[in-house]
Amino acid sequence: IWELKKDVYVVELDWYPDAPGEMVVLTCDTPEEDGITWTLDQSSEVLGSGKTLTIQVKEFGDAGQYTCHKGGEVLSHSLLLLHKKEDGIWSTDILKDQKEPKNKTFLRCEAKNYSGRFTCWWLTTISTDLTFSVKSSRGSSDPQGVTCGAATLSAERVRGDNKEYEYSVECQEDSACPAAEESLPIEVMVDAVHKLKYENYTSSFFIRDIIKPDPPKNLQLKPLKNSRQVEVSWEYPDTWSTPHSYFSLTFCVQVQGKSKREKKDRVFTDKTSATVICRKNASISVRAQDRYYSSSWSEWASVPCS
Amino acid sequence: RNLPVATPDPGMFPCLHHSQNLLRAVSNMLQKARQTLEFYPCTSEEIDHEDITKDKTSTVEACLPLELTKNESCLNSRETSFITNGSCLASRKTSFMMALCLSSIYEDLKMYQVEFKTMNAKLLMDPKRQIFLDQNMLAVIDELMQALNFNSETVPQKSSLEEPDFYKTKIKLCILLHAFRIRAVTIDRVMSYLNAS
């Protein structure tokens, strides 16, 4: 058993049929010695008396809020949560496996630049009685500070018969140099509590590996005189690290005909313009990627040819 | 510790081309190592990230763009003195700070070159003949060092009398390649910045 926060404790259980469970001793936080009784949750049934209560925790029915009283007055609470271990593996029932970039990916994180700011998100099908708490650091043995905000519900989607909820959190490394060469990864730890079930999820990454620039901005077409051609130009996104001559991007330019069957033409360029033959109903799209360290491509910025 | 904006002679900054080739070569070599050594811990997640130049050179700090010198977190107090007669800019206007930056890059390359050559000598003795260093990568390191044109005493190749442990050597190769790729990215960024200045 260990303390998650004040008056909230996590009991770690090996979860299998007829498991013996864990013996837990609860102590009432009071100077009083006599006349103390214990109850669980909303029930008025007295579970025991005395300053301490010994219980055998085997299943969710044994978890919950234990309260010690004296003469109708509440003295203190202890909330017991369960953390299940099945076949040596901690349960992951609360969050959905996103399977990207690999199986058992519950947390996904992205950064728009090298400032040390990043966003993580996760998915669940649970809609109520759910709380998250997020901690992060650079490295684990001698951790350096990363500050995370509160996790918030950022999207709701319908997937078949189920509703899916996306939560996200923003974190910022306390003292980040955009030009630094990372040797210790960022660690992100999410505590998830659903009713009386506790689970924790972790992710470890270098900022350089989770970079995904915003799409290029100001994608524009300028017709060229006496020609079917247009000059396509775009700019670095505002959120990208500066100076741009140091933090350079490379771009993918794609021309797609009206029908999806038509063959796409695409090129890669370090420049911020190209010349395109603009056919009716075609569209021109541009996306960006760090020029020197190939992490994710941005989403496409698109403009119709008409 | 920063790069003042300098005005190189017209035309392509001579080292940019070489640094692009360096990054391409080390990325290809790392990819080859990951594929060939698939049953060894050779991915970014599996290896320990070590920097053989730590406390010996200070490329990131010495080559910091002017715009980042206002960022307290970027200003490390490490001081290292370097030879300052680089000719990469092909211009007498090469500032002291820029020479410091370029000589730091040169020292990095020299250190990695020695490590890679020593390692290759060991790998050539492996009866499995599983992996060797790409000669193109070694040649590209050499070309960039020549373009940087610093006079520096040659470091003798490390030789070892004990029987090489090929498993450890291959893991060390992965560690070195990962670290060298990260440094090659920094070098490319620096050269691109200097080219635009």
């Epitope: 090129v267 890669f268 395109v276 056919r279 | -």
Partner: nanobody, 124 residues
Framework: EVQLVESGGGLVQAGGSLRLSCASS????????MGWFRQAPGKERESVAT????????DYADYVKGRFTISRDNAKNTVYLQMDSLKPEDTAVYYC???????WGRGPDEYDTWGQGTQVTVSS
């Protein structure tokens, strides 16, 4: 693998025009980005113009923009460079090059297949 042969070079007066052709042998011509490069005596090889696989996307070096036009005919396995308003500084050996997915703007190292070159001389 493609093989490339340039033609159409020659001597021309300043202000005149030339049309260079680059013929490719190989059935996979339309899988390649094509580029024209040039090299003047004592200088580095530099990019002139590049064209995408279907010919829809093109790019030009600033020093030839508005004067040169790159095009291709995939049925004939040929790429062209129409050079108008020629200047003495355009004098160089012009090379045709091919690559499957080069990064434009990064210079000759992105291209793996080259022609032998054709001389263009512009007299004043």
């Amino acid at each position: 693998e493609v093989q490339l042969v340039e033609s159409g070079g020659g001597l021309v007066q300043a202000g005149g025009s030339l049309r260079l052709s680059c013929a490719s042998s190989g059935r996979t011509f339309s899988n390649y980005n094509m580029g024209w490069f040039r090299q003047a005596p004592g200088k580095e090889r530099e990019s002139v113009a590049t064209i995408s696989r279907s010919g829809v996307i093109t790019d030009y070096a600033d020093y030839v923009k508005g004067r040169f036009t790159i095009s291709r005919d995939n049925a004939k396995n040929t790429v062209y460079l129409q050079m108008d308003s020629l200047k003495p500084e355009d004098t160089a050996v012009y090379y045709c090059a091919a690559a499957r997915s080069p990064v434009w703007g990064r210079g000759p190292d992105e291209y793996d297949t080259w022609g032998q070159g054709t001389q263009v001389t512009v007299s004043s």
